[in-house]
Interface confidence: medium
């Protein structure tokens, strides 16, 4: 092989446009064609003032979570690709995102990927006929719940109609109608389940997130091939623009341990 003449490869960030419904996971892929042994990969959101706000980072095989744990960075097994996911996206997550690779001092180099746009749309109970992104993990359950609730409501309406007919035809029997109804097990589900669906989706999602601080990683084809290990790292500094000066303190702890001195 002659001396390699590949240029130092830029980053790619895909898809360029991503649309998800609120509550779904939004996943971008940041890819580096070449990866060094020592680097930092940052995930940014572009603020309205065109500043880069750091969401999360990957450094020396450690995930460095940001303030908001919904933003996840996962290294895929090939070492070059990184999934950058927003767990349970919110409407205000819509915006411009990018990733940046920082090759560490003394010869600091910073590469930024092209920008990508995320659109988070309002959730509708009826799923769109053509989904622009992979369905979320909950979609099947949600569909089942919607069908279930619809069935219960139809059942309740039919029962009310039947009660009304009975009341009209047998006026004396109206006193006993409620008793008969209360013994019918499926009917119990109606009043019990109904309040859940009066909740605003966002509120429901919030309660779930409070109970489970580490929601499952986004569903991906590679899911069975790798594990996301979130290490407790230093608190990230969101809103700080990556620069050579800010990196002097970001030198990773020396990975001098481990068999064979392997780095990553």
């Amino acid at each position: 092989l002659d001396s390699p003449d590949r240029p130092w490869s830029p980053l790619t960030f895909s898809p360029a446009q991503l649309t998800v419904q609120e509550g779904e996971n939004a996943t971008f892929t940041c890819s580096l064609a070449d990866i060094p042994d020592s680097f930092v990969l940052n995930w940014y959101r572009l603020s309205p003032r065109n500043q880069t706000d750091k969401l999360a980072a990957f450094q020396e095989d450690r995930i460095e979570p940001g303030r908001d744990r919904r933003f996840r960075v996962t290294r895929l097994p090939n070492g070059r690709d990184f999934h950058m996911s927003i767990v349970a996206a919110r409407l205000n997550d819509s915006g411009i995102y990018l990733c940046g690779a920082i090759y560490l001092p003394p010869n600091t180099q910073i590469n930024e990927s092209p920008r990508a746009e995320l659109s988070v749309t309002e959730r509708t109970l009826e799923p769109p006929t053509q989904s622009p992104s992979p369905p979320p993990r909950l979609s099947g359950q949600l569909q089942g719940l919607v069908i279930g609730v619809t069935s219960v409501l139809v059942g309740v309406l039919l029962l009310l109609l039947l009660t009304w007919v009975l009341a009209a035809v047998f006026p004396r029997a109206t006193r006993g109608a409620c008793v008969c109804g209360s013994e019918d097990e499926p009917l119990k589900e109606g009043p019990d389940a109904a309040p859940v669906f009066t909740l605003d989706y966002g509120e429901l999602d919030f309660q779930w997130r409070e109970k489970t601080p580490e929601p499952p990683a986004p569903c991906a084809p590679e899911q069975t091939e790798y594990a996301t290990i979130v290490f407790p790292g230093r608190p990230a500094s969101p809103g700080r623009r990556a620069s050579a000066s800010s990196l002097q303190g970001a030198q990773p702890p020396s990975p001098e341990d481990g068999p064979g001195l392997w780095p990553l």
């Epitope: 001396s3 390699p4 240029p7 130092w8 580096l32 064609a33 070449d34 990866i35 060094p36 042994d37 020592s38 680097f39 097994p77 090939n78 070492g79 070059r80 090759y103 560490l104 001092p105 003394p106 010869n107 180099q109 790798y226 594990a227 020396s254 990975p255 001098e256 068999p259 064979g260 001195l261 392997w262 780095p263 990553l264």
Partner: antibody
């Protein structure tokens, strides 16, 4: 354009010394672990030594331990191999490389090699 | 030291035909991290070596998908689905889990 250019190879007498250099360009040298690999002409590859990104961690093949020293100057994008007490069996083409061993990085660059001949 | 043994030591294949090279390690190359530190290199006549595959299955940038790596633990294989004239050279496997890092003795691929 990514390049690794070795130099310093020469004909030297047994017991003599040499310093090999490898100048890197076109990629963030200071972020890569560097390796020296040698090859006796017509024979296989043999790992010689390795230095991590910061320069403080090094490792050597048993055959060269105590005689060779690997070092790097990240400010100059240069990798070195100081060779003392040279023996006839050190005669080989010496390559500097990245992404050889030990690494999981998704890139590997090799120089063209510099020839060291140890003969009386 | 981990000994890497390649078979066959030479191979003659016609263009368009498949080729397969085996590499056996004297001990497992699987690390507790889940990574297996096995690499494949090719050296064309009169040139420097080039890495083709890292961590058993991942191709280096620019390496055609005709090349594929497989295996686990101690037994590994490099396959070329359809050999081309340009594939001639010596193929080496190498391990990166334990110092000293070792290479196989090489397999010479000749195109008929």
């Amino acid at each position: 354009q990514v390049q690794l250019v070795e130099s310093g190879g020469d004909l030297v007498k047994p017991g003599g010394s040499l310093r090999l250099s490898c100048v890197a360009s076109g990629f963030p040298f200071s972020s890569f672990h560097m390796t020296w690999v040698r090859q006796v002409p017509g024979m296989g590859l043999q790992w010689v030594a390795y230095v991590k990104t910061g320069g403080s961690s090094t490792s050597y093949a048993d055959a060269v331990k105590g005689r060779f020293t690997i070092s790097r100057d990240n400010a100059k994008n240069t990798l070195y191999l100081h060779m003392n007490s040279l023996r006839a069996e050190d005669t080989a083409l010496y390559y500097c490389a990245t992404g050889v061993v030990p690494t999981t990085v998704a890139s590997s660059y090799w120089g063209q090699g510099t020839l060291v001949t140890v003969s009386s | 030291d981990i000994v890497m043994t390649q078979t066959p030591l030479s191979l003659s294949v016609s263009p368009g035909e498949p080729a397969s090279i085996s590499c056996k390690a004297s001990q497992s190359l699987l690390h507790s991290s889940g990574y297996t530190y096995l690499y494949w290199f090719r050296q064309k006549p009169g040139q420097s070596p080039q890495r083709l595959v890292y961590k058993v299955v991942y191709r280096d940038p620019g390496v055609p998908d005709r090349f594929s790596g497989s295996g686990s633990g101690t037994d590994f294989t490099l396959r070329i689905s359809r050999v081309e004239a340009d594939d001639a050279g010596v193929y080496y496997c190498g391990q990166g889990i334990k110092d000293p890092f070792t290479f196989g003795q090489g397999t010479k691929l000749e195109i008929k």
